[in-house]
């Protein structure tokens, strides 16, 4: 091991304060006691250390805690968190939501870094499930967080946590993710009345099955076209023209503009043309009058 340079007389750091910004890297290494640094981590953030100086401070903590930092230190890492690697973070055991918030604050306004992703992963795994407070926090910092999770990971979200989800949090979710989230949302909002229920469930409807869409069509919900376009194609296809008209209400006129796009295009292909004509929108491509429609899926089920 390389022999360490001794701290010059009178230069030993007795507290973590602004005088340390004038210390050279070797002086920080020689004169700052790691235990002192650990107990006064909350002061580091207020001191304009250079990146090189922060490297030295990180090295001192790494030496003191080779198995991973304790939470008392992690909570006060501040900008030193940006120096941590995912490998460092995997050694941590973060259980406090306050610690998580403190570290997410450091990275605020930036894309989710590998460090942050690892931190969140460690935190959620430590908790065992994605509870409401955690979800609240994560989606506040990263609106797209929920949609970055796999369907398997989303399955650990308790229905109670769904209350924390805002519409924009689901913007980038794909149908597989909404398939997992929708039943949870349905459960979470089940005691709400019709119009309030629809407002809450609306952003999750990309995971709704046909029977739920049929039920909604009986409730005068006036679904907007943007929501309709995000519905599962397989859930929309069995809906009748009358059901779609009731589901969309005054927004039904918007179907014309979307007739070449899924799921509207595929739905039109499944409807009788004379049923489509009743809408008076000039929708074309339905099944001509007199044609017999065979539901092959039904036939397969019977055989």
């Amino acid at each position: 091991e390389v022999e360490k340079t001794a701290c010059p007389s009178g230069k030993k750091a007795r507290e973590i304060d602004e005088s340390l910004i004038f210390y050279k890297k070797w002086e920080l290494e020689a004169c700052v006691d790691a235990a002192l640094l650990a107990t006064q981590m909350d002061r580091v953030n207020a001191i304009p250390f250079t990146y090189e100086q922060l490297d030295v401070l990180k090295h001192k903590l790494d030496e003191l805690y080779p198995q991973g930092y304790p939470e008392s230190v992690i909570q006060h890492l501040g900008y030193l968190f940006l120096k941590m690697s995912p490998e460092d973070i995997r050694k941590w055991n973060v259980t406090s939501l306050e610690t998580l918030k403190a570290l997410l604050e450091v990275n605020k306004g930036h894309e989710m870094s590998p460090q942050v992703a690892t931190l969140i992963d460690r935190f959620v795994k430590g908790r065992g499930q994605l509870d409401k407070d955690t979800l609240d926090t994560l989606t506040a910092f990263y609106p797209g967080y929920l949609c970055s999770l796999s369907p398997e990971e989303l399955s650990s979200v308790p229905p109670s946590s769904i209350w924390a989800v805002r519409p924009q949090d689901l913007d980038t979710c794909d149908p597989r993710q909404l398939d997992v989230l929708y039943p949870k949302a349905r459960l979470a909002f089940q005691n709400m009345n019709g119009s309030e229920y629809f407002v809450k469930i609306q952003s999750f409807l990309g995971g709704a099955p046909t029977e739920d869409l049929k039920a909604l069509s009986q409730q005068n919900v006036s679904m907007d076209l943007a929501t309709f376009m995000k519905l599962r194609t397989d859930a929309v296809l069995p809906l009748t023209v009358a059901e779609v008209q009731k589901l969309l209400g005054p927004h039904v006129e918007g179907l014309k503009a979307e007739e070449r796009h899924r799921p509207v295009r595929d739905w039109i292909l499944r409807q009788r043309q004379d049923d489509l004509d009743t809408l008076g929108l000039g929708l074309q491509g339905g099944i001509p009058n007199g044609y017999l429609v065979l539901d092959l899926s039904m036939q397969e089920a019977l055989s």
């Epitope: 010059p8 009178g10 007795r14």
Partner: antibody, heavy 118, light 109 residues
Framework: QVQLKESGPALVKPTQTLTLTCTFS??????????VSWIRQPPGKALEWLAL???????SYSTSLKTRLTISKDTSKNQVVLTMTNMDPVDTATYYC??????????WGQGTLVTVSS | DIVLTQPPSVSGAPGQRVTISCSGS????????VSWYQQLPGTAPKLLIY???KRPSGVPDRFSGSKSGTSASLAITGLQSEDEADYYC??????????FGGGTKLTVL
């Protein structure tokens, strides 16, 4: 509250070794950033810094007295001991122990007068 | 040897302002913070100013400290009879670890 108290012989003979004990309460010498020092003051004269022992057992001594001084601590007993060899009448002084927290001597003992005389 | 130089004595009438100077070098005051201690007759010293100009709780704001280059000074405004005491400046030192000034006796006339 934080308190420090010096104890030791009031009279020592020239060439003898002085042993002083500082017993403290209200803080721990294993807490980061904390240390205990010895400072002396000859009658009617200025304060003179002697030695310091820190939370991490780091020891510092006055350059001019380095060869004669030894400082040690017993954290479990909350005590710091200073020994000073080869005492001389010019070492007659009130000896204070003081806690240093951060950069400052924030609490002092009442002092103990040591007279060196044959 | 006294490393920090202070005037042996200063005096002032009640209500007046007095200053006590403390001169050092780049190895102490020039590169480190200055503290001031007050020693009332027959008692142990008491921390009066730390970090050049900060007051511990309980110290009246009549006491203030400043530092410039390798010198420091203590100012006392609205002088009171109970301020009569010895005042010591001190600093960490790159050569001597920690040093005190020779002390200044303040007399309130």
């Amino acid at each position: 509250q934080v308190q420090l108290k010096e104890s030791g012989p009031a009279l020592v003979k020239p060439t003898q070794t002085l042993t002083l004990t500082c017993t403290f309460s209200g803080f721990s010498l294993s807490s980061s950033g904390v240390g205990v020092s010895w400072i002396r003051q000859p009658p009617g004269k200025a304060l003179e810094w002697l030695a310091l022992i820190d939370w991490d057992d780091d020891k510092s001594y006055s350059t001019s007295l380095k060869t004669r001084l030894t400082i040690s601590k017993d954290t479990s007993k909350n005590q710091v001991v200073l020994t000073m060899t080869n005492m001389d009448p010019v070492d007659t002084a009130t000896y204070y122990c003081a806690r240093i927290q951060g950069w400052n001597y924030d609490v002092w003992g009442q002092g103990t007068l040591v007279t060196v005389s044959s | 040897d006294i490393v920090l130089t202070q005037p042996p004595s200063v005096s002032g009438a009640p209500g007046q302002r007095v200053t006590i100077s403390c001169s050092g070098s780049s190895s102490n005051i020039g590169n480190n913070r200055v503290s001031w201690y007050q020693q009332l007759p027959g008692t142990a010293p008491k921390l009066l100013i730390y970090g050049n100009n900060k007051r511990p709780s309980g110290v009246p704001d009549r006491f203030s400290g400043s530092k410039s280059g390798t010198s420091a000074s203590l100012a006392i405004t609205g002088l009171q009879s109970e301020d009569e005491a010895d005042y010591y400046c001190s600093a960490w030192d790159l050569l001597e670890v920690y040093v005190f000034g020779g002390g200044t006796k303040l007399t309130v006339l």
